[in-house]
């Protein structure tokens, strides 16, 4: 079938990086600058993506592949193929409609993107809080007091449940 198709359609012989030029008797012509064809047998080349404004070029457009964009410092990619750039926030913050806001008590964000997430509730796993949580870091859970044999550890038991480091009940 492939052989038959090739005989019938000369365009099928045009490799990626070219297009089948009807104006030149269906000869395979190279994609012009700022265009590409990622598959063979194409009758047109696609226009290359332009990485402008908040986008910056990660990789140039070649004859066979589109340009790849990234975001300028202070922004990060969202969506397939970095279709959008979203403003970075500091650790301990999340992006809202009004800009970057600190994480509420009992939540944290250890990245420059994404939302604030609740601290881990150590007691749900029968554990105790080893290190208190902050806006930037989750709590660190340790073994439950019952697991500690006398003299096995010098870890001080956590303060009452209202102290930072516990998720709201």
């Amino acid at each position: 079938f492939e052989r038959t198709r090739s005989l019938q359609d000369p365009c099928s012989n045009c490799p990626a990086g070219t297009f089948c030029d009807n104006n030149r008797n269906q000869i395979c012509s190279p994609c012009p600058p700022n265009s590409f064809s990622s598959a063979g047998g194409q009758r047109t080349c696609d226009i290359c993506r332009q990485c402008k404004g908040v986008f910056r070029t990660r990789k140039e457009c070649s004859s066979t592949s589109n340009a790849e964009c990234d975001c300028t410092p202070g922004f990060h990619c969202l969506g397939a193929g970095c279709s959008m750039c979203e403003q970075d926030c500091k650790q301990g913050q999340e992006l809202t409609k009004k800009g970057c806001k600190d994480c509420c008590f009992g939540t944290f964000n250890d990245q420059k993107r994404g939302i604030c997430r609740p601290w881990t509730n150590c007691s749900l796993d029968g554990k105790s809080v080893l290190v208190n949580g902050t806006k930037e870091r989750d709590v660190v859970c340790g073994p439950s007091p019952a697991d500690l044999s006398p003299g096995a550890s010098s870890v001080t038991p956590p303060a009452p449940a209202r102290e930072p480091g516990h998720s709201p009940q």
Epitope: P15, A16, G17, T18, S29, P30, C31, P32, P33, N34, F36, S37, C48, C51, R56, T57, R58, K59, E60, C61, S62, S63, T64, C69, D70
Partner: antibody, heavy 118, light 112 residues
Framework: EVQLVESGGGLVQPGGSLRLSCAAS????????MIWVRQAPGKGLEYIGF???????YYASSAKGRFTISRDNSKNTLYLQMNSLRAEDTAVYYC????????????WGQGTLVTVSS | DVVMTQSPSSVSASVGDRVTITCQAS??????LAWYQQKPGKAPKLLIY???TLASGVPSRFSGSGSGTDFTLTISSLQPEDFATYYC??????????????FGGGTKVEIK
């Protein structure tokens, strides 16, 4: 006038380091792919690598690890840091600007000679 | 690596001759190929890129063609200033930010 002027070449001992500079005038380097190419005496051209308009660097496999390309936008200057130099690194080093958003060099400097010898 | 094989390595020709230089890539590079001219003691000059696009200021007697692995530079009517060495160059991206932007070995066009 649109031009590139390389400097920093000279004699260096094997194992030594050298930093080449390429001063651009008439255009801003952070809007282009900026490229380093070298040519050993009497030999052909060898592509070293480039820094693109987004600030990302790419290197030929032979240059990766020993050579580092950087730029100073405020000085409109391109750099090539070369470490652990060997006799076979002796060459004329050219900086160049890419054409039309690509890494094909179209505007070239005059070149600077680096000689690695004891 | 992408290996670019240029032929012939040298050619003797006269003014007015039609000269053809070929370049073969070890793997398909689409139409990501350029041609350069270099004269002794001078920096190279870009003639053609994207296999067939004439660079700014380059005379129309220079033309490029080909795609995939096989490419050709043609000088339709050789002029005295065309005696020089010609190089092809691929653009090809590998993985881990490594590039195979490889030059061919060169073709020296000499006076017959």
């Amino acid at each position: 006038e649109v031009q590139l002027v390389e400097s920093g070449g000279g004699l260096v001992q094997p194992g030594g380091s050298l930093r080449l500079s390429c001063a651009a005038s008439g255009f801003t380097i952070n809007s282009y792919h900026m490229i380093w190419v070298r040519q050993a005496p009497g030999k052909g051209l060898e592509y070293i690598g480039f820094i693109n308009d987004g600030g990302f660097t790419y290197y030929a496999s032979s240059a990766k690890g020993r050579f580092t390309i950087s730029r100073d936008n405020s000085k409109n200057t391109l750099y090539l840091q070369m470490n652990s130099l060997r006799a076979e690194d002796t060459a004329v080093y050219y900086c160049a600007r890419g054409v039309d958003g690509t890494s094909y060099p179209d505007l070239w400097g005059q070149g600077t000679l680096v000689t690695v010898s004891s | 690596d992408v290996v670019m094989t240029q032929s012939p390595s040298s050619v003797s020709a006269s003014v007015g001759d039609r000269v053809t230089i070929t370049c073969q890539a070890s793997q398909s590079i689409g139409s990501d190929l350029a041609w350069y001219q270099q004269k002794p003691g001078k920096a190279p000059k870009l003639l053609i890129y994207r296999a067939s696009t004439l660079a700014s200021g380059v005379p129309s007697r220079f033309s490029g063609s080909g795609s995939g692995t096989d490419f050709t530079l043609t000088i339709s009517s050789l002029q005295p200033e065309d005696f020089a060495t010609y190089y092809c160059q691929s653009i090809y991206y590998g993985s881990d930010d490594v590039i195979y932007h490889t030059f061919g070995g060169g073709t020296k066009v000499e006076i017959k």
